[in-house]
């Protein structure tokens, strides 16, 4: 058993049929010695008396808010949560496996630039009685500071019969140099509590590997005389690291109709303009990627050909 | 310590081309190592990230773009002195700081070159003959060093009398390649910045 936060404790349980469970001793936070009784949650049934209460925790029915009283007055609470271990593996029931970029990916993180600011998000089908707490650091043995905000519900989607909820959190490395060469990864730890179930999820990454620039901005078209060719120009996104001559991007320019199966014109360039062939009912799209370290491409920025 | 904006005239910067080749060569070699050594811990997640130039050169700091010198987190206090004559400095306006930056890059390349050559000598003794260093990568390191054209003491190639542990050597190769790729990215960024300034 360990303390998650003040008056909240996590009991780690091997979860299998007829498991013996864990013996837990609760101590009432009071100077009183006599006349103390214990109850669980909203029940008035007295579970025991005395300053300490010893319980055998085997299942979710044994978890919950234990309260010690004296003469009708509440003295203190201890909330017990369960963390299940099945076949030596901690449970991952609360969050959905996003399976990208690989199986068992529960947390996904992205950074728009090298400033040390990043966003992580996760998915769940649970809508109520759910809380998250996020901590982060650079490295684990001698951790350097990363400050994370509160996790917030950022999107709701309907997937078949189910509703899916996306939560996200923003974090900022306390002293980040955009030009630095990372040797220690960022560690992100998410504590998830659903009702009386506790789970924790972690992710480890280098900022350079989670870079995904914003789409290029200010796409403009200039038809070329006596030609079907169009000069398309754009600018670096505002959120990208500066100076741009140091933090350079490369671009993919594509002309395509509404269907992905349609024919297309495609060209890659390091410049902020390109010449392509425009077709009726097609769109010109441009996306960006770090020129020197191939992490993710940005989303497309698009303008219609006509 | 930073790169000033008054740097060589555009198109006068022969090192840019070489640095692009360097990044390409080390990326290809790393990809080849990951594929060939698929049963070894050779991915970014599996290896320890070591920097053989740590406390010996200060490329990131010496080559910091002017715009980042306002960022406290970028200004480390490490100071190193370097030789200051180089052919990539294709303009008289070249500052001492830029010379410091380019000579730091030169020192990095020299250190990696020695490590890679020593390692290749060991890998050539491996009866499995599983992986060797790409000669193109070694040639590209050499080309960039020649373009930088700094005079410095030659570092003797390390020779070891004991029987090499090929498993350890291959893991060390992965560690070196990952670190060198990161440094090659920095070098490419620096050359691009200097070329544009």
């Amino acid at each position: 058993i360990w303390e998650l936060k003040k008056d909240v404790y996590v009991v780690e349980l091997d979860w299998y049929p007829d498991a013996p469970g864990e013996m837990v001793v609760l101590t009432c936070d009071t100077p009183e010695e006599d006349g103390i009784t214990w109850t669980l949650d909203q029940s008035s049934e007295v579970l025991g008396s005395g300053k300490t209460l010893t319980i055998q925790v085997k299942e979710f029915g044994d978890a919950g808010q234990y309260t010690c009283h004296k003469g009708g007055e509440v003295l203190s609470h201890s909330l017990l949560l369960l963390h299940k271990k099945e076949d030596g593996i901690w449970s991952t029931d609360i969050l959905k496996d996003q399976k990208e970029p690989k199986n068992k990916t529960f947390l996904r993180c992205e950074a728009k630039n090298y400033s040390g600011r990043f966003t992580c998000w996760w998915l769940t089908t649970i809508s109520t009685d759910l809380t998250f707490s996020v901590k982060s650091s650079r490295g684990s043995s001698d951790p350097q500071g990363v400050t994370c905000g509160a996790a917030t519900l950022s999107a709701e989607r309907v997937r078949g019969d189910n509703k899916e909820y996306e939560y996200s959190v923003e974090c900022q490395e306390d002293s980040a140099c955009p030009a630095a060469e990372e040797s220690l990864p960022i560690e992100v730890m998410v504590d998830a509590v659903h009702k009386l179930k506790y789970e924790n999820y972690t992710s480890s990454f280098f900022i350079r590997d989670i870079i995904k620039p914003d789409p290029p901005k200010n796409l403009q078209l200039k038809p070329l005389k006596n030609s079907r060719q169009v000069e398309v120009s754009w600018e670096y996104p505002d959120t990208w690291s500066t100076p741009h001559s140091y933090f350079s991007l490369t671009f993919c320019v594509q002309v395509q109709g509404k269907s992905k199966r349609e024919k297309k014109d495609r060209v890659f360039t390091d410049k902020t303009s390109a010449t392509v062939i425009c077709r009726k009912n097609a769109s010109i799209s441009v996306r960006a990627q770090d020129r020197y370290y191939s992490s993710s491409w940005s989303e497309w920025a698009s303008v219609p050909c006509s | 310590r930073n790169l000033p904006v008054a740097t060589p005239d555009p198109g006068m910067f022969p090192c840019l081309h070489h640095s692009q080749n360097l990044l390409r060569a080390v990326s290809n070699m790393l990809q080849k190592a990951r594929q060939t050594l698929e049963f070894y811990p050779c991915t970014s997640e599996e290896i320890d990230h070591e920097d053989i130039t740590k406390d010996k050169t200060s490329t990131v700091e010496a080559c910091l773009p002017l715009e980042l010198t306002k960022n406290e987190s970028c200004l480390n206090s490490r100071e190193t002195s370097f030789i200051t004559n180089g052919s990539c400095l294709a303009s008289r306006k070249t500052s001492f700081m830029m010379a410091l930056c380019l000579s730091s890059i030169y020192e990095d390349l020299k250190m990696y070159q020695v490590e890679f050559k020593t390692m290749n000598a060991k890998l050539l003794m491996d009866p499995k003959r599983q992986i060797f260093l790409d000669q193109n990568m070694l040639a590209v390191i050499d080309e960039l060093m020649q373009a930088l054209n700094f005079n410095s003491e030659t570092v003797p190639q390390k020779s070891s009398l004991e029987e090499p542990d090929f498993y350890k050597t291959k893991i060390k190769l992965c560690i070196l390649l990952h670190a060198f790729r990161i440094r090659a990215v920095t070098i490419d960024r620096v050359m691009s910045y200097l070329n544009a300034s």
Partner: antibody, heavy 118, light 107 residues
Framework: QVQLVQSGAEVKKPGSSVKVSCKAS????????LHWVRQAPGQGLEWMGW????????EYAPKFQGRVTITADESTSTAYMELSSLRSEDTAVYAC???????????WGQGTLVTVSS | DIVMTQSPLSLPVTPGEPASISCRAS??????LHWYQQKPGQQPRLLIA???QSISGVPSRFSGSGSGTDFTLTISSLQPEDFATYYC?????????FGQGTKVEIK
């Protein structure tokens, strides 16, 4: 299976014209760009131009501009390349090639040898 | 027009050995570079698109690398059926242009 079948070999006099056909099968004809590339005996490849069969848009290499005409007939899934004012140096194998991507070629015709000789 | 220069023009190789063909562009073309294989009496076959993207059905021993002006086609271990002429082609701008070809011959 996508296939491009070209017309047979031709022998032409200098100053005349030649029209080579390329019939596509497998896949929708207008879903692809169609190019013409030639190869003189023992020489390399030379791109001549492309057509978008969907709308008849064409683009020609400056070297052939004014001498080459590429057309397409959607009803028969056939593209044509006509080269006029033939000279002996136009002796080559002319091949059609297509792709959903405009700028490179993933399926080629078998080629048509055009010999220009007096 | 962008001029594509291949080297060497002839490459004698022992079967089972690796082979590398170089292609250089007269100006930067990013990764707009494609590789083809042509056997005598046959039309070219696409091997690699956009400098390094493998093509479905092409053996994995063929790989491409490069960007900007310098590109390489590598055959990791030459098989008897790989003896042919190889062409690079740029798609950075029109007119599309090819290298002059590299003939890979049996040593």
């Amino acid at each position: 299976q996508v296939q491009l079948v070209q017309s047979g070999a031709e022998v032409k006099k200098p100053g005349s014209s030649v029209k080579v056909s390329c019939k596509a099968s497998g896949g929708t004809f207008s879903d692809y760009y169609l190019h013409w590339v030639r190869q003189a005996p023992g020489q390399g490849l030379e791109w001549m131009g492309w057509i978008d069969p969907e709308n008849g848009d064409t683009e020609y290499a400056p070297k052939f501009q004014g001498r080459v005409t590429i057309t397409a007939d959607e009803s028969t899934s056939t593209a044509y390349m006509e080269l006029s004012s033939l000279r002996s140096e136009d002796t080559a194998v002319y091949a059609c090639a297509r792709n959903k991507e405009l700028r490179y070629f993933d399926v080629w015709g078998q080629g048509t040898l055009v010999t220009v000789s007096s | 027009d962008i001029v594509m220069t291949q080297s060497p023009l002839s490459l004698p190789v022992t079967p089972g050995e690796p082979a590398s063909i170089s292609c250089r562009a007269s100006q930067s073309i990013s990764i707009n570079l494609h590789w083809y294989q042509q056997k005598p009496g046959q039309q070219p076959r696409l091997l690699i698109a956009f400098a390094s993207q493998s093509i479905s059905g092409v053996p994995s021993r063929f790989s491409g690398s490069g960007s900007g002006t310098d590109f390489t086609l590598t055959i990791s271990s030459l098989q008897p059926e790989d003896f042919a002429t190889y062409y690079c082609q740029q798609s950075n701008s029109f007119p599309l242009t090819f290298g002059q070809g590299t003939k890979v011959e049996i040593k």
